[in-house]
């Protein structure tokens, strides 16, 4: 595949990455799958600067990111290390709250109305953000 040099139509370029902001809601797993089908992944926030960029574009709306602990430890979908990486949880979060009564706790992370993060039930239909790196080889064959 060829190296992607510019962002697809309707995607926003920022710091050598491309971002796509949904305007509808999906469960976390469906959002994750949507991004994968676009040869991308749910957004992985690695810096305060990236946090502010995403926050500016999503506004005060609950929005899924690529962070979850469905397998036990907190993990970013692209393999970025959670332990040493950037974190922006709301105070008291994550709390794996069981009081929602939907069964189980809370295993998926989202941006809240003030941009800080919360863990929530993965089935909730929130908006989402896809991200792909410009330097990543695309799956499309090169134009001859």
């Amino acid at each position: 595949g060829s190296e992607r040099t510019c962002c697809p139509v309707n995607w926003v370029e920022h710091e050598r990455s491309c971002y796509w902001f949904s305007r509808s809601g999906k469960a976390w797993a469906d959002a994750d799958n949507y991004c994968r089908l676009e040869d991308a992944h749910l957004v992985v926030v690695t810096s305060w600067e990236e946090q502010k960029f995403v926050q500016h574009h999503i506004g005060p709306v609950n929005t899924w990111m690529g962070l979850h602990d469905q397998n036990g430890p907190w993990k970013w979908v692209d393999g970025t290390d959670y332990e040493t990486g950037f974190k922006n949880w709301r105070p008291e979060q994550p709390d794996d709250w069981y009081g929602h009564g939907l069964g189980g706790g809370e295993d998926c992370a989202h941006f809240t109305d003030d941009g800080r993060w919360n863990d929530d039930v993965c089935q909730r239909p929130y908006r989402w953000v896809c991200e792909t790196e410009l330097d990543k080889a695309s799956q499309e064959p090169p134009l001859l």
Epitope: D69, W89, D96, W97
Partner: antibody, heavy 115, light 107 residues
């Protein structure tokens, strides 16, 4: 590497108190719910108590409610279980474990309640 | 509280066998079930979580299935290191509850 190490077990008389500790390392402790699970000699596993990452939510088994207190110190990466009014039936190996489905366990510490 | 039952309480099997252990919840717990293996004098070890997801580092000879109230753990090609006690636990709601265990020993 994720590690959980319990300490503080020992022999105590009925009605006595004991404080168990669990030292955690290898992960961002404050991001995880932690649990105490016990196992009486020759018996099965029994969930005892859970505490959310920032201590906002705390849960106890009916068998220990009012006698045991779970707490944590995220600055010290430590989980605690204060056990008061101990009974013979509290004799068990006490394990600390991470997350609601206990993906990681400590080696356990033995608590013996006997006169 | 949700009660968990397991069957059988014990079973004898031979090396190479395929064994199945059943766990039943007194009310629906969706997929919120974990299976543990415990050997004498050791801490339990999680094998399967979310009813059917294999824990990292656990061999694929272990598999889980089920949802709602009925769940199974299957161990294929039983080996000497698999002889142990197996527990299920629900984490759908507090208080968390364990099954009484199934001891798998050598025939």
């Amino acid at each position: 590497e994720v590690q959980l190490v319990e300490s503080g077990g020992g022999l105590v008389k009925p009605g006595g108190s004991l404080r168990l500790s669990c030292a955690a390392s290898g992960f961002t402790f404050s991001s995880y719910t932690m649990n105490w699970v016990r196992q009486a000699p020759g018996k099965g596993l029994e969930w005892v108590s859970s505490i959310s990452g920032s201590s906002s939510y705390i849960y106890y088994a009916d068998s220990v409610k009012g006698r045991f207190t779970i707490s944590r110190d995220n600055a010290k990466n430590s989980l605690y279980l204060q056990m008061n009014s101990l009974r013979a039936e509290d004799t068990a190996v006490y394990y600390c474990a991470r997350v609601s489905w206990a993906d990681c366990w400590g080696q356990g510490t033995l608590v013996t309640v006997s006169s | 509280d949700i009660q968990m039952t397991q069957s059988p309480s014990s079973l004898s099997a031979s090396v190479g066998d395929r064994v199945t252990i059943t766990c039943r919840a007194s009310q629906g717990i969706s997929k919120y079930l974990v299976w543990f293996q415990q050997k004498p004098g050791k801490a339990p070890k999680s094998l399967i979580y979310a009813a059917s997801s294999l824990q990292s580092g656990v061999p694929s000879k272990f598999s889980g299935s089920g949802s709602g109230t009925d769940f199974t753990l299957t161990i294929s090609n039983l080996q000497p290191e698999d002889f142990a006690t197996y527990y299920c636990q629900q984490y759908n709601s507090y208080p968390f509850t364990f099954g009484p265990g199934t001891k798998v020993d050598i025939k």
